[in-house]
Interface confidence: low
């Protein structure tokens, strides 16, 4: 059938120490997030249909001002990538919070059934869990 | 019929005092903006078909430098939300102009026929009306 | 046939002196970039099917810190536009790197067969060629 696979997720929590991944959640009971095709595996988004996808993300840092992002030696960085299967591991999209408190971007990329996407936030600042400030989604656009 | 509803709008003007909304306009006579399905109601975008939409926006502040955005106690913030009907009022997407002069983002969200989207710009700085710097659009992507 | 035209490009190189254009490349052999419908003409993206397109871009500056973007009198600016045919020349999307090192945005715009899109980066800073930091793409979304 025509691939309508689509998902929009909201932040659930950050990972334990040494785990830079953001953990996502989705579903109408949670608000305006949803999964229609893709699925969540321990908070990470797994693709179920091959194709080219538009991947988009916005992450806003909590307790943030331009000084809090600029005064760190190691800038806070957000990377979206395929983290499994290991043979397909790759960084798809990467941004740093220089003197800002929000990053937002999007890109087209081929994804395959079974690809699990990870969103790694490195640095000491915390992401906002407000649903209009931090979200992550994919949309199948063609085979 | 298959939902191809789509719109791309350009800024018309800001609201009067105490009205933080941006007022939009669209149509080929104005340039590269258009409405095909959605409609404008007093400068606000109204949805005419249920579905999941990709909502995107870029707003650039006029007469802006990184010092003008950082020196205000009240940061300039842009929020896109459903403002009517009141029962569905919600903030969908929110960004602050910390030390920057442009925000741009996008997200997938379910919208229903009759939902009116508002774009609220709070703060004392004015948005640019250049059509390549400030624009707002929606695209129906699936039922 | 139904228009599935789509492309995602990675940066090849910057132009020679006095040429602000970025030169792009795409194809599976290069990584995750591809052209399915549109084509490249000397590193510039040419549209082959009329329609409304979602145009998106992310550009990250190399060897960049918030001070390197803020200390220039003339801010580094990225503009995406139609550069040929000359009769249709127009700026579609424009952003400045104020105190940041990455810009990312997207917009819907009508494009016609034969339109060539140029991405002009003005300023003295160089863009990163990392494929997860700098990319440019278009997606046909409706007639």
């Amino acid at each position: 059938s025509l691939g309508w696979d689509i998902a929009e997720l909201q932040l659930n929590h950050t990972g334990p120490q040494q785990d830079p991944r953001l953990y996502w959640q989705g579903g109408p009971a949670l608000g305006r997030s949803f999964l229609r095709g893709p699925e969540l595996d321990k908070g990470q988004l797994r693709i179920r249909r091959d194709g080219i996808y538009m991947v988009h993300i916005q992450v806003t840092l909590a307790i943030c001002s331009s000084t809090s992002t600029s005064r760190h030696h190691h800038p806070t960085t957000l990377a979206v990538g395929i983290c499994s299967p290991a043979s397909r591991s790759i960084s798809l999209l990467r941004l740093s919070f220089h003197q800002g408190c929000t990053i937002a971007s999007q890109r087209l990329t081929p994804l395959a059934r079974g690809d699990t996407l990870c969103t790694n936030l490195t640095g000491t600042l915390l992401p906002s869990r407000n649903t209009d400030e931090t979200f992550f989604g994919v949309q199948w656009v063609r085979p | 019929s298959l939902g191809w509803d789509i719109a791309e709008l350009q800024l018309n003007h800001t609201g009067p005092q105490q009205d933080p909304r941006l007022y939009w306009q669209g149509g080929p006579a104005l340039g590269r903006s258009f409405l095909r399905g959605p409609e404008l109601d007093k400068g606000q975008l109204r949805i005419r078909r249920d579905g999941i939409y990709m909502v995107h926006i870029q707003v650039t502040l006029a007469i802006c430098s990184s010092t003008s955005t950082s020196r205000h106690h009240h940061p300039t913030t842009l929020a896109v939300g459903i403002c009517s009907p009141a029962s569905r009022s919600i903030s969908l997407l929110r960004l602050s102009f910390h030390q920057g002069c442009t925000i741009a983002s996008q997200r997938l969200t379910p919208l229903a026929r009759g939902d009116t989207l508002c774009t609220n710009l709070t703060g004392t700085l004015l948005p640019s009306r250049n059509t390549d710097e400030t624009f707002f659009g929606v695209q129906w992507v699936r039922p | 046939s139904l228009g599935w035209d789509i492309a995602e490009l990675q940066l090849n190189h910057t132009g020679p002196q006095q040429d602000p254009r970025l030169y792009w490349q795409g194809g599976p052999a290069l990584g995750r970039s591809f052209l399915r419908g549109p084509e490249l003409d000397k590193g510039q993206l040419r549209i082959r099917r009329d329609g409304i397109y979602m145009v998106h871009i992310q550009v990250t500056l190399a060897i960049c810190s918030s001070t390197s973007t803020s200390r220039h009198h003339h801010p580094t600016t990225l503009a995406v536009g139609i550069c040929s045919p000359a009769s249709r020349s127009i700026s579609l999307l424009r952003l400045s790197f104020h105190q940041g090192c990455t810009i990312a945005s997207q917009r819907l715009t009508p494009l016609a067969r034969g339109d060539t899109l140029c991405t002009n980066l003005t300023g003295t800073l160089l863009p990163s060629r990392n494929t997860d930091e700098t990319f440019f793409g278009v997606q046909w979304v409706r007639p």
Partner: antibody, heavy 131, light 118 residues
């Protein structure tokens, strides 16, 4: 450095309305990511959250005090005010104002917040309810 | 509304470590809650110590020594405040506070009085 200072009458008669102001210096009460709370502490007892006002003026109240509590603000004075109506001797307490980090957003029937921590407190003002 | 239980009092010797608990009532999983901790000395307002949601979602108050740390004990459905290298100046009342993302009603525990012996 953010500083908060409570002010108001030390003695209020039963059935009257208690009004306390909190003046903030070193930061604006309209700054995003903060909201502004009132907390009280009866003699020899623990802390009780009464309510808060957000950076955009939204108000939140403790369910047990909701019918008697009102919080407002005057941005020109950088001040927020607590009003507690129909007071009784049980309302005798030290009243604190505090800044809270963690902006609240209301979405789809639920409140979401980034953090919830009372990071700056006033010195407190003693209020006695007695005839 | 969550009910938080703290032991009314506890005591420990200087230099030792102490663990203060903040137990949520049944039906409220500690994993879903943000917990913040406050110290109050006699005659003074409370002071913010730290906030804890998970090991990487936490925040230490300005000027608060690293001797103070937070954690959770899911088996006891409790938030924990750990104080190591106990000092005489740590003698105070300690309060926990929680709020979860389904409501906005911050609740404080009843407080624990910590006595430093000797």
């Amino acid at each position: 450095q953010v500083q908060l200072q409570e002010s108001g009458p030390g003695l209020v008669k039963p059935s009257q309305t208690l009004s306390l102001a909190c003046t903030v210096s070193g930061g604006s009460i309209t700054t995003s990511y903060y909201y502004w709370s009132w907390i009280r502490q009866p003699p020899g007892k623990g802390l009780e959250w009464m309510g808060a006002i957000g950076s955009r003026g939204s108000t939140y109240y403790s369910p047990s005090l909701k019918t008697r509590t009102s919080i407002s603000r005057d941005t020109s004075k950088n001040q927020f005010t607590l009003q507690l109506s129909s007071v009784t001797p049980e309302d005798t307490a030290v009243y604190y104002c505090a800044r809270v980090t963690g902006e609240i957003t209301y979405n789809s029937g639920s409140y979401y917040y980034t953090l919830n921590l009372f990071d700056y407190w006033g010195q407190g003002t003693q209020v006695t309810v007695s005839s | 509304q969550s009910v938080l239980t703290q032991p009314p009092s506890l005591s420990a010797s200087p230099g030792s470590s102490v663990r203060l608990t903040c137990t949520l009532s049944s039906g409220n999983s500690v994993g879903n809650y943000d917990i913040s901790w406050y110290q109050q000395k006699a005659g003074s307002p409370p002071r913010y110590l730290l906030y804890y949601y998970s090991d990487s979602y936490k925040n230490q108050g300005s000027g608060v020594p690293s001797r103070f740390s937070g954690s959770k004990d899911p088996s006891a459905n409790a938030g924990l405040l750990l104080i190591s290298g106990l000092q005489a100046e740590d003698e105070a009342d300690y309060y926990c506070s929680v709020s979860n993302s389904g409501t906005y009603k911050p609740v404080f525990g009843g407080g624990s009085k910590l006595t430093v012996l000797g």
